[in-house]
Amino acid sequence: KEEQISFRDCAEVFKSGHTTNGVYTLTLPNSTEEVKAYCDMEAGGGGWTIIQRREDGSVDFQRTWKEYKVGFGNPSGEYWLGNEFVSQLTNQQRYVLKIHLKDWEGNEAYSLYEHFYLSSEELNYRIHLKGLTGTAGKISSISQPGNDFSTKDADNDKCICKCSQMLTGGWWFDACGPSNLNGMYYPQRQNTNKFNGIKWYYWKGSGYSLKGTTMMIRPADF
């Protein structure tokens, strides 16, 4: 049997016997386009494809629609995997989304959505979420029903303002809503009363800008 050498996600990488955390090359079925993604092979059984990470403010997240489409940053550090890849991936089979959060006081929490997918670019990569559990709030900090994705050059929110310009970063803004994990990174002791920080309201409340965030996906049947 010929060994599989292309993997669509980190779950496939894990099942092939690669069980070490790190950056792997992923390729969608029937595609030659490759993306580099960080795979978490330890958390909750492993096989997680990291689609977003914030940890130190080293990467600028105030990017264009195209940059959020194709991805940017460093998969070993802060990065955005890319809306197009995630959209295609999550429309091929059912995925769960886990969002892991860290505050500046040493606390950690997570939100787990049992079904997650992004619509196509034609539908502005609208986010679809179902079935919230976890410790980062009983109510979803990503507005429900899901919104279209907005960036500084693509205003698809429900606000009379331009949320991406006001809050910075690309996100599924409402008007503007209870979260923005792609906001400005603020260091410790400068992270409260922020109008444009890294926000997850139903865990830390308004104006609190988080220390770290990771968004990761995995097939529901893993």
Partner: nanobody, 129 residues
């Protein structure tokens, strides 16, 4: 650094009055809507009153309508809450909070709680005889 500081709380008898102040620093009130909220022991934080940024229009919770008045003095970068005919059920910690102008859904007039990103530390109001 954005800061909101409330003052004016204290102990007052039922039927009495208090005037709360919310002094802002690190930003100018002209570009923000300001809300007053309160939280009684063991209860959720609730909106009391707010004043819009652009036209100065005001909102009041049903429980305080006709008794409380919100106003702003942009030259002093301060918002006030005049509270008259106070009742024991008005006892709570009162907070002021700010939200940038225009962070509103099309067709809506008032801001949800989660849009207020800057908060003061609160001032305690106790209504008791």
């Amino acid at each position: 650094e954005v800061q909101l500081v409330e003052s004016g709380g204290g102990l007052v008898q039922p039927g009495g009055s208090l005037r709360l102040s919310c002094a802002a620093s690190g930003f100018t009130l002209d570009d923000y809507a300001i809300g007053w909220f309160r939280q009684a022991p063991g209860k959720e934080r609730e909106g009391v009153s707010s004043i819009r940024d652009n036209d100065g229009s005001t909102y009041y919770a049903d429980s305080v309508k006709g008794r409380f008045t919100i106003s702003r003095d942009n030259s002093k970068n301060t918002v006030y809450l005049q509270m008259n005919s106070l009742r024991p059920e008005d006892t709570a910690v009162y907070y002021c909070a700010a939200v940038p102008a225009g962070r509103l859904r099309f067709g809506e007039q008032w801001y949800p709680l989660y849009e207020y990103d800057a908060w003061g530390q609160g001032t305690l109001v106790t209504v008791s005889s």
